[in-house]
């Protein structure tokens, strides 16, 4: 670390005095201090001498000696006071620029440490400081206004009490700049616009910033529009607004509109699209298939997207049958607006019951007319099975009826013993019926099929099982003959048990 001679922290001299400051280090050393006249600098290897034969109040300040080659960057300092009875202040700068919330140092250096007790900071022409101005004083550095605000951008003077009267410094102008976080904030309203030819339209482009220095313009398809600008200041922000009013829109007004604002930090732009149409429109669509299949007991949400201008005058979900005349609950219908001209309507069917299969229609109306979108909802059912013993053309026949959706497949099993359900170990024979007769196949209903198994003689210690399955599940019915008679016995002689 360099050493300064004289080895005191501060030195007080009178004007005209000779001052010699010597700095010695291990290597070459350098002096740094306030810019002032009459100093002579002499360097000799590891020492440097700063001297003047005629000290003035302008030499007041802190002189620091550094050793550039020192990796630790050590330095030494001495503060020099040149106490001039006529000039209590040495002002190092007459303009100070800071950003809001920074500390602002007003560099009026006191030339006589004795005067410290009577110093104060005032605004020019003797005006007091603004309320809430928080400041401190250092005789070596001057006055510091802490966390300066934009409103404190003023001209200040430093005041010292000398012989009962206040002596002012020359003025220091403080400029507190707003912290501009970036380019101005923009809004372009509306985000999207549709009008029928001949209607009126308004597009508003507005920009705001903490600083007044910014520009804003509106352009249509890359052409800058000449629009009068309205300016305002509120919520501590400057606002500039451009309003484009079109009394009767035509197709040439359609296209892309961009709102562009710029300042020193850069440029922001936002765009919207203006569509001019010949007449009202109403379009319904769905991302879902209009033919839906859901397993009974499960839930389904039907969604319709609506694009419309002008806005909807009415809309509703309607159940068109075929099972009942009850309509969907309003609370199960939900509407969400994606934007001004696009909406999504959802019908929630949380636990589908057999009577809720059928057609669901979404209807909407605007000045362009009515539109409808219809969903067809078919429910899937696991098969339900029953078996009876009957005679067909004199032959004993087991008749299996299976109903479900999708259409069930039928398999017959014959197994040993009496059982509710044949397992693999008991199975004696298996017959697949690839083409069971379809008894009924109406839209939205279960498909009922019938399969016949001709049995010449019913074996009494055996079980005949009809098993039906589809994509939802399977069902079966076990037929157990309980009679000692021959195959010609009427059906009520036999017991069929589930």
């Amino acid at each position: 670390i360099p050493v300064i001679e004289p080895s005191v922290p501060e030195l007080v001299v009178k004007p005209g005095a000779t001052v010699t400051l010597r700095c010695v280090g291990n290597g070459s050393v350098e002096w740094d201090g306030p810019p002032s006249p009459h100093w002579t600098l002499y360097s000799d290897g590891s020492s440097s001498i700063l001297s003047t034969n005629n000290a003035t109040f302008q030499n007041t300040g802190t002189y620091r000696c550094t050793e550039p080659g020192d990796p630790l960057g050590g330095s030494a300092a001495i503060h020099l006071y040149v106490k001039d009875p006529a000039r209590p202040w040495n002002v190092l700068a007459q303009e100070v620029v800071v950003f809001e919330d920074q500390d602002a140092l007003l560099p009026c250096l006191l030339t006589d440490p004795v005067l410290e007790a009577g110093v104060s900071l005032v605004r020019v022409r003797g005006r007091p400081l603004m309320r809430h101005t928080n400041y401190s004083f250092s005789p070596w550095h001057g006055f510091t206004i802490h966390r300066a605000k934009f409103i404190q951008s003023q001209d200040y003077q430093c005041s010292a009490l000398m012989g009962g009267r206040k002596v002012m410094s020359i003025s220091i102008r403080l400029k507190v700049q707003k912290v501009i976080p970036g380019p101005p904030a923009l809004t372009l309203v509306p985000a999207e616009l549709v009008r029928i030819r001949g209607e009126a339209a308004q597009i508003v482009c507005s920009a705001s910033s903490v600083d007044v220095n910014f520009d804003v313009f509106l352009q249509h398809n890359n052409t800058k529009l000449a629009i009068p600008q309205q300016s305002d200041f509120h919520n501590n922000r400057y606002q500039k607004v451009l309003t484009l009013n079109l009394d009767q829109v035509d197709f040439q007004h359609a296209g892309n509109y961009s709102c562009v604002a710029s300042n020193v930090q850069g440029k922001h732009s936002t765009s919207m699209f203006f569509r001019v149409v010949e007449s009202a429109y109403l379009n319904l669509s769905s991302e879902q298939n209009l033919i839906q299949e859901v397993t009974v007991g499960e839930g389904l949400n039907l969604k319709v997207m609506v694009e419309a201008y002008p806005g909807l005058q009415g809309f509703n979900w309607t159940y068109l049958g075929p099972f009942s005349d009850h309509q969907p609950e309003p609370k199960l219908a939900n509407a969400t607006t994606k934007d001004t001209y696009r909406h999504t309507f959802t019908l929630s069917l949380p636990r589908l019951k057999p009577s809720e299969a059928g057609r669901y229609s979404f209807l909407a109306r605007n000045p362009g007319g009515w539109r409808a979108l219809t969903f067809e909802l078919t429910l899937r059912y696991p098969p339900e099975v029953s078996v009876i013993w009957t005679f067909i053309n004199g032959s004993g026949t087991l008749l299996c009826a299976a109903s479900g959706y999708p259409q069930p497949n039928v398999t017959w099993l014959q197994c040993s013993g009496h059982t509710d359900r044949c397992d693999e170990a008991q199975v004696l024979q298996v017959w697949d019926d690839p083409y069971p007769e379809v008894l009924s196949q109406e839209p939205f209903h279960k498909v009922t099929v019938q399969s016949l198994l001709t049995v010449e003689t019913l074996e009494h210690n055996q079980t005949y099982e009809c098993r039906a399955h589809n994509s939802v599940g399977s069902g079966s019915w076990a037929f157990i003959p309980i009679s000692a008679g021959a195959h010609t016995h009427p059906p009520d002689e036999f017991l069929f048990t589930p």
């Epitope: 007991g297 005349d325 009850h326 696991p382 339900e384 939802v472 599940g473």
Partner: antibody, heavy 115, light 108 residues
């Protein structure tokens, strides 16, 4: 076509656990919701709870702390367990299928709780 | 929970007469998910009407249901001897599913 057949212990002591099973015949447990309902002697019907094929359950809040309903799709069966029974749980217990309301019912099992 | 109140508690009529049974809900029944059941001594209940007005499979057309919201009615247009039983209404629109206390239809 579809029939529900139920079984289980008919006589219990207080604090024991009631256990009933319901089998689905001629159809499948793989869709619909399946419920348990009870009816105290000479009184009205009370819904106990339900289960679907994926095992999702829903219980009557008045019994929720004591009820467990479980299902076995491979056997086409579902079961009811009611713990810590008292005399107030004496009732005929029914299993039922919910399609449009409770369209198919079991034959009922009389359960008596007595010390 | 939704409380269902049936009236009258007992209805005494003769075969051939018209029976009107009422069921009132403490709050609106979702999507008219209201059912009517018939129960005879020693038997399980039998579904008559679902969705407030739809007849279940195999139910004679002398049975009809009507109503929405909180007020529902079961009508038997011409009583047959086998119709004398206890009738329950039930809502299955919101959990817990609840039944009315029942209306006993007896022979006068």
């Amino acid at each position: 076509q579809v029939q529900l057949q139920q079984w289980g212990a008919g006589l219990l002591k207080p604090s024991e656990t009631l256990s009933l099973t319901c089998a689905v015949y001629g159809g499948s447990f793989s869709a619909y919701y399946w419920s348990w309902i009870r009816q105290p002697p000479g009184k009205g019907l009370e819904w106990i709870g339900e289960i679907n094929h994926s095992g999702s359950t829903n219980y009557n809040p008045s019994l929720k702390s004591r009820v467990t309903i479980s299902g076995d799709t491979s056997k086409n069966q579902f079961s009811l367990k009611l713990s810590s029974v008292t005399a107030a749980d004496t009732a005929v217990y029914y299993c039922a299928r919910e399609a449009d309301a409770f369209d198919i019912w079991g034959q009922g099992t009389m359960v008596t709780v007595s010390s | 929970e939704i409380v269902l109140t049936q009236s009258p508690g007992t209805l005494s009529l003769s075969p051939g007469e018209r029976a009107t049974l009422s069921c009132r809900a403490s709050q609106s029944v979702s999507s008219s998910y209201l059912a009517w059941y018939q129960q005879k001594p020693g038997q399980a209940p039998r579904l008559l009407i679902y969705g407030a007005s739809s007849r279940a499979t195999g139910i004679p057309d002398r049975f009809s249901g009507s109503g929405s919201g909180t007020d529902f009615t079961l009508t038997i247009s011409r009583l047959e001897p086998e119709d004398f039983a206890v009738y329950y209404c039930q809502q299955y629109g919101s959990s817990p599913y609840t039944f009315g206390q029942g209306t006993k239809l007896e022979i006068k």
